[in-house]
Structures are given as C-alpha cells and as structure tokens.
Amino acid sequence: TLNSVLNSNAIKNLPPPLGGAAGHPGSAVSAAPGILYPGGNKYQTIDNYQPYPCAEDEECGTDEYCASPTRGGDAGVQICLACRKRRKRCMRHAMCCPGNYCKNGICVSSDQNNFRGEIEETITESFGNDHSTLDGYSRRTTLSSKMYHSKGQEGSVCLRSSDCATGLCCARHFWSKICKPVLKEGQVCTKHRRKGSHGLEIFQRCYCGEGLSCRIQKDHHQASNSSRLHTCQRH
C-alpha cells in the first residue's frame, strides 16, 4: 500500500513530488536564467523581445500586466500590456497602474485609508502557472506596487481554502498546497473512515460541492472493500 511505501521511506515508488519545482511541482524547482542570478547574463535583457510574451502578471514590468492583446482572444497567447490608469476599467488589481487597485471593475487610487482593510483578505499568490516569477526586482511588496491579488485561481499556492476563489479549495499537491476545484456530482472523491486511518495523501482531492456528499457508487456495492469507488452524490 502507499502507506507502507511511505512509512518505509522507499522513495522510488512514491508518486510525484515536484516540482517542483520546482517545483511543481514542483512542482519542481528553480528560476529563470538571469533572473535568479542578477549580473551580466544575456537573458536579463528584455528590450529585444517586444511585445513580451507572458503567462502571468509577475513576468511583466511594474507598469504592465499580462493579458491577451485582443478582447476575447486566445488565453494561450498573452503579452505584457500597459497598465490601466485611474478610472479605467479592470478585472483584477494587477491591471491597474502602481498606486491604484481594481474596485468594482474600475481602477481607483490606493491612497485611501480603507484600502488595506478592504482587500487584505484577498492577498494570495495567484500565479496560475507552475513556474518561477522572478523579475530581478521586487514586485507587489508595497501598497504602491501591485501587491494585492484577487483570490487564488486553480493551481495557485495556498495556505487555506479561504485563499482560493469560489469553487476551489486548498488541497495538497506533491509536497505543497494548491487551489483545486471543489468536486462536482459524479466525480470521484476520497472518503476517510476515521481520522488518522489513511496514509499520506500526496495528491489530495477537494471535498464535494454544496448539496453533495461522498458516498459509495451504487454499482460498486458488490466490489471488495479495497476497491469501492466513492463519488459525489446528491444528499
């Protein structure tokens, strides 16, 4: 069993632990050339690579955000775009220029007293992609830079489920914790008979969504105990 494998520390049979690191994962584990290691490195020069392709906001400059260049464009083709100034439309904090944040779809000044309290609970590392985001400079570390993110999207590292967006929970993945989708009706779920009775879960599933519970799938009642399949079912 996985439990006995883990207890014996026989690492060769373990499921993935990325990273990485990576990792990823991780998982994985490392940084991009010339980013982790500042100094005369070719890869630090970005002037020659415009428009700069990106996967997330952290890869762009402080006055930029990462998005598809065309409205409704292919999400897989994204570049660094100029940040939105005050009173411009936005969908997340990173779209607004330094000194502003996204409130009700509009970039507003962050110089208001209530700014920190309003969005403190949404602070999370919502990188969305499993890779390093080193820029060679500090980002989102002060109110004037874009420190505040919306709630963690799927794949974002989290500490608790409240860090994750609606429909996601914080669950173990490899040796880390990330936001994963809450299970829907019919999806396989994990049923723990007693707390502490199960082995280490390297890849933890979320719980079943609202109105659902994790029960033995009806056509699996005859199966042996060890192979009974649990799925999310209506109460």
């Epitope: 883990l6 690492i11 060769k12 373990l14 499921p15 993935p16 632990p17 990325l18 990273g19 990485g20 690191a21 990576a22 990792g23 990823h24 994962p25 991780g26 998982s27 994985a28 584990v29 490392s30 940084a31 982790l36 999370t124 590392e125 990188f127 992609n129 499993d130 890779h131 390093s132 985001t133 080193l134 500090s138 570390t141 590292v157 989290c158 500490l159 173990r172 993945h173 490899f174 040796w175 880390s176 914790k177 990330i178 280490l200 890849f203």
Partner: antibody, heavy 114, light 112 residues
C-alpha cells in the same frame, strides 16, 4: 524579491557535522514543499531530501538517509539541512529548491576533507 | 528511479545555426493533473542552474524565444533556433514527477 539564499557551507572534517540554512523571501514559503539538491564538483545534480509544506513529511535519498535531517521553520521562512557523520563523498554545492513553481538558490559549497 | 537519457552528449554549433538536444525518460512524465513534469536547464561553469523550460514547452520568464521545448510522455526535445555565443554550456533535462528527482547526463554545447 522572490529568492532562496543558502548559507552555512564550509570546510569540515569527515565524521563532523554541519547545518545548512536556506532563507526564502518574496513568496508564500509555508505553502510550498521544499527540497535540497546537491552537485559534486564536475558532476551532475543529485536530489537529497524533501520536506512537505507543513514540515510533517520528510523523505531522503538512500545516500544520506540516517545522516541528514531536513527541517523548516515557517515562521522564519527558513529551510534547514542538518548534516551529520559527513563523508568525503558529501562534498558538493548544496542548493535548496522550491517545487511546483521551480526556484533554486545559488548554492553553498560544503567541502568534507581531513 | 526514473532514468533520464540525453543525446548527443556533445554538440558543436556554428553561430546562427540551429541545435537540437534529445531527452528520453524511463517512464512517462505525464501526471494525472495533465501536466508533464519535464524541465530543461543550462549550467555554465561555476554557476547555478539557469532554468529555461518548464513542463516540456513553457519558457521561463525572460528566456529568449529562440529556445523551445517539445515532446510528450517519454520523448522530449530542446531546440535552439539560432545558437548565440552566450548559449554555450551544459544543457540538462530533469524530471520531477517522482522522487528522487533525476537528471540527464548533460549535453555540452560549444561554438565552432
């Protein structure tokens, strides 16, 4: 700045101990599994150990099992590697590494020599 | 352990010309989460690894687009469309889907 900075390396005699540290900054350290990887002079990389985000689960390469201990202090954003009963073959640059969103430090050199 | 096998072990390239490195893994690196945990990195003498590619084909930020990765399952390729002098060093592939993480033997790239 998102980074990992190792320290604690140096020259040590065989059989002695050394503790490496890895200071993390710029990211949610307590959410990530962390690893140690090493590279002997002129050789490739070798995975050493991993610790889960909460420090409860740890696994080691056979070559260091029983001699090395990986630990972490999430309050201090620091990863550790306690190395006991050091051998000449443990001589290497030791890197701490973050999983999932791959990130490595710049390494710290450990030399085991009499 | 998952064995990672790189070919060729050495490569001499004329500046401006393309280069290609192959990496084969002893078992599939495709995870049930849909991701394939294969990385490429470059190491220069006395320097830490500089990661180029994550999950087979995604470039790390600030990596020039002349670097590209492809492949699936157990067969992977790193391509440099036009080699430049700064690209010299040893290129490694790495898997992180299973402990222990394992690495290719490395491919030394030099300029003719």
């Amino acid at each position: 700045q998102v980074q990992l900075v190792e320290s604690g390396g140096g020259v040590v005699q065989p059989g002695r101990s050394l503790r490496l540290s890895c200071a993390a900054s710029g990211f949610t350290f307590s959410g990530y599994g962390m690893h140690w990887v090493r590279q002997a002079p002129g050789k490739g990389l070798e995975w050493v150990a991993v610790i889960s985000y909460d420090g409860n689960d740890k696994y080691y390469a056979d070559s260091v099992k029983g001699r090395f201990t990986i630990s972490r202090d999430n309050a201090k954003n620091t990863l550790y590697l306690q190395m006991n009963s050091l051998r000449a073959e443990d001589t290497a640059v030791y890197y701490c590494a973050r999983e999932l969103r791959v990130l490595w430090g710049q390494g710290t050199l450990v030399t085991v020599s009499s | 352990d998952i064995v990672m096998t790189q070919t060729p072990l050495s490569l001499s390239v004329t500046p401006g010309q393309p280069a290609s490195i192959s990496c084969k893994s002893g078992q599939s690196l495709l995870h049930s989460d849909g991701k394939t945990y294969l990385y490429w990195y470059l190491q220069k003498p006395g320097q830490p690894p500089q990661f180029l590619i994550y999950e087979v084909s995604n470039r790390f930020s600030r990596v020039p687009d002349r670097f590209s990765g492809s492949g699936s399952g157990t067969d992977f390729t790193l391509r440099i469309s036009r080699v430049e002098a700064e690209d010299v060093g040893i290129y490694y592939c790495m898997q992180s889907i299973q402990l222990p993480w394992t690495f290719g033997q490395g491919t030394q790239v030099e300029i003719k």
